[in-house]
């Protein structure tokens, strides 16, 4: 039931991902299902807004980090990818696409420059970046 899937483009090492939808899913075809979430990595570089639109067109959103336990596979993600965290100037907060506010200690936020969007990096790090910069991205869909 569990199979080792090596996703060289996304993960730093071999990760154990359930491949049968009886244990997780349903998910769109070729997406990764893990602990009731569907994930897909897109290796074409887009700015944050284009990345968001791409995810939305597939009935998904950009990656939302909400639990280190339920999303422990994210520890192994390599490189940097757009996630759904964005600065809302009108109220000064950093929010996910669904409007929920980032829990202060869920991500280690690293600011290398001024920016209003964030990239996800391994071990639950978020890098502040200019939203117009092209980057790869991760889409996510909740199964429950």
């Amino acid at each position: 039931i569990w199979s080792a899937v090596f996703l060289n483009s996304l993960f730093n090492q071999e990760v154990q991902i359930p491949l049968t939808e009886s244990y997780c899913g349903p998910c769109p075809k070729n997406w990764i299902c893990y602990k009731n979430n569907c994930y897909q990595f897109f290796d074409e570089s887009k700015n944050w807004y284009e990345s968001q639109a791409s995810c939305m067109s597939q009935n998904a959103s950009l990656l939302k980090v909400y639990s280190k336990e339920d999303q422990d596979l994210l520890k192994l993600v390599k490189s940097y990818h757009w996630m759904g965290l964005v600065h809302i100037p009108t109220n000064g907060s950093w929010q996910w696409e669904d409007g929920s506010i980032l829990s202060p200690n869920l991500l280690t936020i690293i600011e290398m420059q001024k920016g209003d969007c964030a990239l996800y990096a391994s071990s639950f790090k978020g890098y502040i970046e200019n939203c117009s910069t092209p980057n790869t991205y991760i889409c996510m869909q909740r199964t429950v």
């Epitope: 600065h87 100037p89 009108t90 109220n91 000064g92 907060s93 950093w94 506010i101 980032l102 829990s103 202060p104 280690t108 936020i109 690293i110 600011e111 290398m112 420059q113 001024k114 920016g115 964030a118 502040i128």
Partner: antibody, heavy 120, light 107 residues
Framework: QVQLKESGPGLVAPSQSLSITCTVS????????ISWFRQPPGKGLECLGV???????NYNSVFKSRLSIIKDNSKSQVFLKMNSLQTDDTARYYC??????????????WGTGTTVTVSS | DILLTQSPAILSVSPGERVSFSCRAS??????IHWYQQRTNVSPRLLIK???ESISGIPSRFSGSGSGTDFTLSINNVESEDIADYYC?????????FGAGTKLELK
Amino acid sequence: QVQLKESGPGLVAPSQSLSITCTVSGFSLTSYAISWFRQPPGKGLECLGVIWTGGGTNYNSVFKSRLSIIKDNSKSQVFLKMNSLQTDDTARYYCARKGDEGYWGYFDVWGTGTTVTVSS
Amino acid sequence: DILLTQSPAILSVSPGERVSFSCRASQSIGTSIHWYQQRTNVSPRLLIKYASESISGIPSRFSGSGSGTDFTLSINNVESEDIADYYCQHSNRWPLTFGAGTKLELK
């Protein structure tokens, strides 16, 4: 006009707790984060913690076990409470408004500060 | 924690001179550095944000440069009102820290 004003006890006995209020005007605490800093006499600035627009907080780990920051948006007030004060906590304490850019960012408006002396 | 080292500790200048303050970070922090001026018995005042961005109301003689680990604050044509302590602050990650400061004094 954007302003921040700290008010504190002035003198605190060793082992006692410190409470300081930061009252802001000219902007809303629902739109700007507020951070607390301190500066011992003749020394540099130290960041104690920050309270975000939604009420979440980050504390400097040096003070985490004895520091609390809360706020009342309707009264435009932010409160700092620090427990178990010692003489080396003697300092001028400032609140400051985080600028509206970036994540951790910079501090564009500062209060005048309140001097806290820890002595018996 | 990120350590910010400011040098020199004291700078002596004559009015009209150009002066530069150095701030070095213990690791690369991009452009996430900010500069403050603190006159005697006064609160800090933001001078420069994100290494080189100017602040409304701050005289144009103040400028900043640098990225990565090495940053510089410069004052062209120093005036007597510029006598103060100058601090750099990083915003790369929590906790935010400041340099120990550089004191600008008149010769």
